[in-house]
Each structure stands twice: as C-alpha cells, then as structure tokens.
Interface confidence: low
C-alpha cells in the first residue's frame, strides 16, 4: 500500500523520497518565504483503516513572505561602501540543488528546494562532477540514535508560548 502524490501547499515544495506507508516527508517553503511559527511542515503517509486507503496527513504549514525580504528596497545603481564592511547573508541557505530521481509536488515549479531526509544521519559528500550535495542515510547500526519506538516529547512551552502542536494565537504574521 502506497500513498498518492501529496497535496500542494501554497508557496511550498515537497520532494517525496518514499510513498510507502508511514513515510514522513517535509515541505520546504519556497525562496522568499518562510515557515510561519507554530505551523508544521511535516506530513505522514497513513492508512485509513475504514477504507484501507493510504493518504498523506494534512500539514498545517503556512509559508509567509519573509519579512526580511518584503521591506528591502532595491539597491541604487551604484553604491559606495565607506566603512569597508562587506554585507553578509543573514543566514546560510540550502544548496538549492535538486536531488536526482525525485519528483516535486508543488504549485511553483520555479522554486529551488533542498532535500530533507527524515531521521537520517547526514553524511554529505560532494559529487566530483556536478558539485551537488549528496545526502546519505545511515541507520542505527552505524552509531546513530535508535529509530525504534521513539517516545513522544513531553515538552512544555516556556514563558507565554503554548505547548507544541498548539498554534500561537494573535500572531502578527500575515500571508
């Protein structure tokens, strides 16, 4: 039993690595968008026991325009940097290389995404010919944490934040 292609999520892509039952996959917000706090990018292939049909759980993901980009003005044609400071990117981004032999489920095919391998120890290796990053999955026998009977986290939100799975109320982000 396998799942059909997952649903589209606005401003997000998903690279499905396995359509098999209980597979977990993660959506990635497109370039220029970010995951709204408290929303989940995870989806799981589950079985509807009544119909014996597999389907993907509905992610609560909301991809909002990155506020850091929304308010940026285009740079003038020529600028002079007087302090000798080289502007640096705010944070490091995924490589944007598309993994081979994967099909995107997306409403924006122009977006670049990074493949996320759930529950895998990352052993990236550079491909000598293309320079793309290959991500290998190593199982528990290679010294990675046990993947069996993972205990649910009993997390308690700090300060005024709600527990996991409860979306923050009155969040100012808008799409």
């Amino acid at each position: 039993i396998t799942c059909p292609p997952p649903m589209s999520v606005e401003h997000a892509d998903i690279w499905v690595k396995s359509y098999s039952l209980y597979s977990r996959e993660r959506y990635i917000c497109n370039s220029g968008f970010k995951r709204k706090a408290g929303t989940s990018s995870l989806t799981e292939c589950v079985l509807n026991k009544a119909t014996n049909v597999a389907h993907w759980t509905t992610p609560s993901l909301k991809c909002i325009r990155d506020p850091a980009l929304v308010h940026q003005r285009p740079a003038p044609p020529s600028t002079v940097t007087t302090a000798g400071v080289t502007p640096q990117p705010e944070s490091l981004s995924p490589s944007g290389k598309e993994p081979a032999a994967s099909s995107p489920s997306s409403n924006n095919t122009a977006a670049t995404t990074a493949a996320i391998v759930p529950g895998s120890q990352l052993m990236p290796s550079k491909s000598p010919s293309t320079g793309t990053t290959e991500i290998s999955s190593h199982e528990s026998s290679h010294g990675t944490p046990s993947q069996t009977t993972a205990k649910n986290w009993e997390l308690t939100a700090s300060a005024s934040h709600q527990p996991p799975g409860v979306y923050p109320q009155g969040h100012s982000d808008t799409t």
Partner: nanobody, 124 residues
Framework: EVQLVESGGGLVQAGGSLRLSCAAS????????IGWFRQAPGKEREGVSC????????YYADSVKGRFTISSDNAKNMVYLQMNSLKVEDTAVYYC?????????????????WGQGTQVTVSS
C-alpha cells in the same frame, strides 16, 4: 552542505553544570526549529529541548525543566544547551537536531538532521 557539530560534553559530578554547543551550517536558521535530544545506553531517545527559531519559542521536557536552558546565536549559527544541577540520570549522548517543535507530540518526534553527538556523563 548541512552540518551539525556538537561540543561541550564531558564528565561532571552531580549538581554540576555543562554547556553544550551546536555549530550549525548549510540551512536557513529561521526556517527550522532546532533542539536537543539524548539517548542513554539501552534506553529510548528522549527529547530534551526545542527552540523555534522563527519566533524564539522554547520548549523543555518535564525532566529538565528549570535546570536546562536552550539558547541560540543566530549571527553565529550556534545553538546552546546550558545544563545546571545535573543528575546521574542525565547521563547520555546528547544530539543537536533540526526538528519541528510543532509536531513532536503528534508524530512522535522526528529528527531530520542530527550531529554526531557529545557524551555527557554525570557521576555521583
């Protein structure tokens, strides 16, 4: 190239403190939640703490609440776990991981990426 590299583990007496560090690179901090989980020999892995970088929300397991503090330095792409009043039962390998605070209860705690781990041993 995504990398998570933990450091700061070691041997400490009960009641002591340690500060674990996680150097992260290769992804946009704000797009993910980052946290710590641990695994003691012969035991299930256990979530310790989680921070949603997009809004700064922090979450703690009941077993460490009030003793552990998670923090981050986004400019340096670093995540820290300050562990105070350590107990013998805190002995484990501690892993820094990219995860999703919002789904750890609904989907059992899924760790997308994790580092090689750092050993923390608390002696009596």
């Amino acid at each position: 190239e995504v990398q998570l590299v933990e450091s700061g583990g070691g041997l400490v007496q009960a009641g002591g403190s340690l500060r674990l560090s996680c150097a992260a690179s290769g992804f946009t901090f704000d797009d993910y939640a980052i946290g710590w989980f641990r695994q003691a020999p012969g035991k299930e892995r256990e979530g310790v703490s989680c921070m949603d970088s997009s809004d700064g929300s922090t979450y703690y397991a009941d077993s460490v609440k009030g003793r552990f503090t998670i923090s981050s330095d986004n400019a340096k792409n670093m995540v820290y776990l300050q562990m105070n009043s350590l107990k013998v039962e805190d002995t484990a390998v501690y892993y820094c991981a990219i995860l999703d605070c919002a789904v750890v209860t609904t989907l059992g705690g899924e760790y997308d990426y994790w580092g090689q781990g750092t050993q923390v041993t608390v002696s009596s």
